[in-house]
Amino acid sequence: ADLGSMGYFELQLSALRNVNGELLSGACCDGDGRTTRAGGCGRDECDTYVRVCLKEYQAKVTPTGPCSYGYGATPVLGGNSFYLPPAGAAGDRARARSRTGGHQDPGLVVIPFQFAWPRSFTLIVEAWDWDNDTTPDEELLIERVSHAGMINPEDRWKSLHFSGHVAHLELQIRVRCDENYYSATCNKFCRPRNDFFGHYTCDQYGNKACMDGWMGKECKEAVCKQGCNLLHGGCTVPGECRCSYGWQGKFCDECVPYPGCVHGSCVEPWHCDCETNWGGLLCDKDLNYCGSHHPCVNGGTCINAEPDQYLCACPDGYLGKNCERAEHACASNPCANGGSCHEVPSGFECHCPSGWNGPTCALDIDEEFGLVPRGSGHHHHHH
């Protein structure tokens, strides 16, 4: 499997001038034995290609040793001297093509790296003469130049010019982070995503920028409906407000009272906190029976007792649960006009003589009710 890369070191060769068409050894590229000091090189020009070695920063550059940061090479670019299009948009397109395995600008070398870019580096650039019959060896070296320095990842190219023993080289370099890597060392990873691992895009610094409706370090926490009481509700999908057990309402801010709670409410779920004057487990017991029913009569004073219970304190002369009965009701001789008084559970009854009527035999039938015959039934007065 491809390891992928955190970034790329890019080198774009712009120009190479080898006016005499010679090798670093002084020999001619065509290999006919002559040197420039013996009358110049012949018809055959050098078949020039470039090799690039990238390694750790060295104050004193050693051309040998491993290219610890990577290496690359170009195809044959031209003869003794040539110019290539400057790096820029073409180079960017080529880089994109090279990463997908497509054709790239011949003068562009892309060296991927899979480590945090250290910023300091050593670059060794070698121009070689291509010979079909031989493998590269020191005899075919045209020029070797080196540069040790620092470079930060950015889109801008940095120009380098080298005047070697034999050839002059002009090139541009830059370091760029791969598309999902950020920071000065290209080791900060951020890939935009919208799935169960997170819902975010990446800002220019590689920080996760949560999509609308999401929050948290990985943008995996949904932002609930505005007003949702997050102590008693929440959401897994943005804009919702799902209540915890025991809570209800649009914003999960209403507790669920104890089932069957009548005259009560709750502050905590499954409670039944009674309204004033109500009691019992379900707040269904009236603690103020007196106030709501007024059961005592005849001036009796009502006293609340157990829930749903009361007592009547009766005034003198009255008794019964509600003070509805008069005590010794006939003692005051309530019956007039010769009526006879009889005590009954509800008070007294007057048995009126012929011609009189009413609760206390005070109504004259002849005067008041001419139509009512004398001696009609009993008339009672209840206290």
Partner: antibody
Amino acid sequence: EVQLVESGGGLVQPGGSLRLSCAASGFTFTNSDIHWVRQAPGKGLEWVGGITPADGYTDYADSVKGRFTISADTSKNTAYLQMNSLRAEDTAVYYCARSYWSSSPGSAFDYWGQGTLVTVSS
Amino acid sequence: DIQMTQSPSSLSASVGDRVTITCRASQDVSTAVAWYQQKPGKAPKLLIYSASFLYSGVPSRFSGSGSGTDFTLTISSLQPEDFATYYCQQSYISPSTFGQGTKVEIK
């Protein structure tokens, strides 16, 4: 050719440990997520957990949180599932799968390994 | 966790039949639903991703639709190689969850 190959399954006693490996090839390991999915005998699929090898981010199902650990070695293109405090209910075929990155919401598992059987029994 | 409820849990059909399997999510999962086919002793294979996109190499008789909470996998004309178990999966909210599966058997 994309390939995922699991190994490390076997018989283990309750309370024991086992480490499964998932060797990846044929794709850029650090440009993918690797997930572990299990299937108990005769049952359906259950997502166990996953990792983003590029930054080491992991997530787990509640049923294995605190007992299982997923890791990845990018130099070896291999993901691991370290299983501790194993229970009888962890008995299953364990698959590793690669997630398919799409610009649409979600991430499907486009390549799966052949699976490795883990049996937890005394 | 989001529950993915598939229906039916099994069905019998003949070659050439049109088969529809539904999957209902307990909460909105956008279009983050995939469908897989699994044959006995084998690993699952991806058929549909993002609710309606046909995965590379999958025959066009398979199609998917839906968004939010209701999703459908349709096989327009059932072929002998399609007899298998089918699973839906949501990958929008962690943890990712699968449906219980639908077994498609030969009538």
